[in-house]
């Protein structure tokens, strides 16, 4: 009776279990009743990082110097290239696909610490009574306008992204 499931590092094809190709190799032909799975090593600048039945290896990541990237760790037949940014620059994501001089803090957040050559910008949420309505890499959260000191009243409450709106006091007749 043909198998319905195979062991680890095997795959089911044509009602039989074939060995997967090891990391660093791609599938050339499936096994048959009489032959083993045929695998071939990945070429230069290619890799496969799992036991697989892929017919094409993946291209190593290119660390584009025009984006400020450089190679941190050269890829092998089993691993992808790892990119990092030029000194003083920071990766925009864990995958490090591009670089920024420093990140900015979004509206609702202020800069707690300005970036240095080794550390990126540190942002903090604007607490009650403070706001930031811009993306910035240096501006702290600004305090809400004090309407009272201008002899005005709050017409619209402030948020972490907007200042309060002041207006004239209703005069009692």
């Amino acid at each position: 009776e043909p198998p319905t499931a195979c062991r680890e590092k095997q795959y089911l094809i044509n009602s039989q279990c074939c060995s997967l190709c090891q990391p660093g190799q791609k599938l050339v032909s499936d096994c048959t009743e009489f032959t083993e799975t045929e695998c071939l090593p990945c070429g230069e600048s290619e890799f496969l990082d799992t036991w697989n039945r892929e017919t094409h290896c993946h291209q190593h990541k290119y660390c584009d110097p025009n984006l400020g990237l450089r190679v941190q760790q050269k890829g092998t037949s089993e691993t992808d290239t790892i990119c990092t940014c030029e000194e003083g620059w920071h990766c925009t994501s864990e995958a490090c696909e591009s670089c920024v001089l420093h990140r900015s803090c979004s509206p609702g957040f202020g800069v707690k610490q300005i970036a240095t050559g080794v550390s990126d910008t540190i942002c903090e949420p604007c607490p009650v009574g403070f706001f930031s309505n811009v993306s910035s890499a240096f501006e702290k959260c600004h305090p809400w306008t004090s309407c009272e000191t201008k002899d005005l009243v709050v017409q619209q409450a402030g948020t972490n992204k907007t200042d309060v709106v002041c207006g004239p006091q209703d005069r009692l007749r």
Partner: nanobody, 116 residues
């Protein structure tokens, strides 16, 4: 395409002054926070000064506070850095940069050499 072209660098004696300019094109200059960043020979990047889009808020590194003044003219799409009381340690290539500070949004720089 974003272009940032710095100018105004040169050789100056200690105690002297220079005014750097950064001509911007390819984006709406008045909407962007702008920075001056410098790199001394063999050293890392140092964030020197920044200015918000309207020009009302500024930032200065401690090393230049009281000596450098950042400004902008949004009608001319130009960023400036007035540098007074220059010191040997101010020798560097000065770059202007725009938010979000990607590697592409980065000028080639202008060299400032402070030497007697």
């Amino acid at each position: 395409e974003v272009q940032l072209l710095e100018s105004g660098g040169g050789l100056v004696q200690p105690g002297g002054s220079l005014r750097l300019s950064c001509a911007a094109s390819g984006f709406t200059f008045r909407d962007y926070e702008m920075w001056w960043v410098r790199q001394a020979p063999g050293k890392g990047l140092e964030r020197v000064s920044a200015i918000n889009p309207a020009g009302g808020y500024t930032y200065y590194a401690d090393s230049v506070k009281g000596r450098f003044t950042i400004s902008r003219d949004n009608s001319k799409n130009t960023l400036y850095l007035q540098m007074n009381s220059l010191r040997a340690e101010d020798t560097a290539v000065y770059h202007c940069a725009k938010l979000p500070f990607t590697f592409e949004d980065w000028g080639q720089g202008t060299l400032v050499t402070v030497s007697s």
